[in-house]
Amino acid sequence: FGISGRHSITVTTVASAGNIGEDGILSCTFEPDIKLSDIVIQWLKEGVLGLVHEFKEGKDELSEQDEMFRGRTAVFADQVIVGNASLRLKNVQLTDAGTYKCYIITSKGKGNANLEYKTGAFSMPEVNVDYNASSETLRCEAPRWFPQPTVVWASQVDQGANFSEVSNTSFELNSENVTMKVVSVLYNVTINNTYSCMIENDIAKATGDIKVTESEIKRRSHLQLLNSKA
């Protein structure tokens, strides 16, 4: 099954994560070739018999694509000539997780690299003051997470404090029966302090900060994918 008389070319991939229901990117680059028609890109997945995607002679070749990927893949055709073989995966499914191989053939030779792709759900948390509560309370909400994350509260003033006794976290299954809405409530909040709601699973870590003063409320949030250089 091997090509005879060809040299090896360098192919580089980056481990990444996909957000269920959204589009994802599987990153792959290679030593470019001067002629687009000489470049063949094949994406394969461990456990899947057919191809995930094939690009050859300057266009997508979807004839041998496995059923589970039909209609969901594309390469960045205009960037192939400069060595970008990254794959766009539409409507990421939980089952898309696994080991992928980016396999490249050019006039210079052939090469391949594996990529670990994780799938789950992750979203930015939003922290608000809960004015309906009897005492000063903060409410941290994030619409979509999977697998079930951990939620930890922290405070700038009381660094290292354990807020588990004064917080309550619930997970509510969303309508598609996979992802969950995360709601965490922190009680006995003091004014002139910055609180952080940190949500984390094995795919992503997200933080929502809120600074409450007498005159204003400032919010900030950020999300970071874990085990990924992307």
Epitope: S4, Q42, E46, G47, L49, G50, L51, L62, E64, Y103
Partner: antibody, heavy 116, light 113 residues
Amino acid sequence: QVQLVQSGAEVKKPGSSVKVSCKASGDTFTTYQIHWVRQAPGQGLEWMGGIMPIFGTTKYAQNFQGRVTITADESTSTAYMELSSLRSEDTAVYYCARRNYGMDVWGQGTTVTVSS
Amino acid sequence: DIVMTQSPDSLAVSLGERATINCKSSQSLLYRPVNKNFLAWYQQKPGQPPKLLIYWASTRGSGVPDRFSGSGSGTDFTLTISSLQAEDVATYFCQQYYSTPITFGQGTKVEIK
């Protein structure tokens, strides 16, 4: 020009196993699927399963699940099909074939006879 | 599983005459994004492996004479031999490769009348 060359005919006892090889020659590469199809005497074609050699990913027909094992050795460009717990109904010609817009290249076939 | 049904089971045609074989699938083999039907036709002569004649329901395989043609879409397909030659005596099979398990029709034996 790609060629698939299969191992020779086998005579086996009921309950035993048979392993048929299929060697690829010519300018092909690892990302073609190799499938196995059998044909009992005077009967039609029956798909048994296939393999993607680059990952060793396999898929089997329900009828053969648990009895058939398809493997591939990239270093020798050879695919193998092993069928266990043989019975007389397994007497057939076994073909390997490359999947490419259907099955465009076939091995010459290996006759397996199961007889006590 | 997709069931493939061929008709007739056997066919006797005079040399130079047209032979027509039908194949019906239990579900559509048309994949709209590429507008192709995942159907192939094979010819098998006694003691030989099958030979790919037609793929994508209507594209002739390498070195296949142009008297062989395939047509149809969705669930109904036809293989036509426009002018039967002596060397065309064989059994013909249709096959779907739209999804696994890959399935074949039961075969149609073509003989000379």
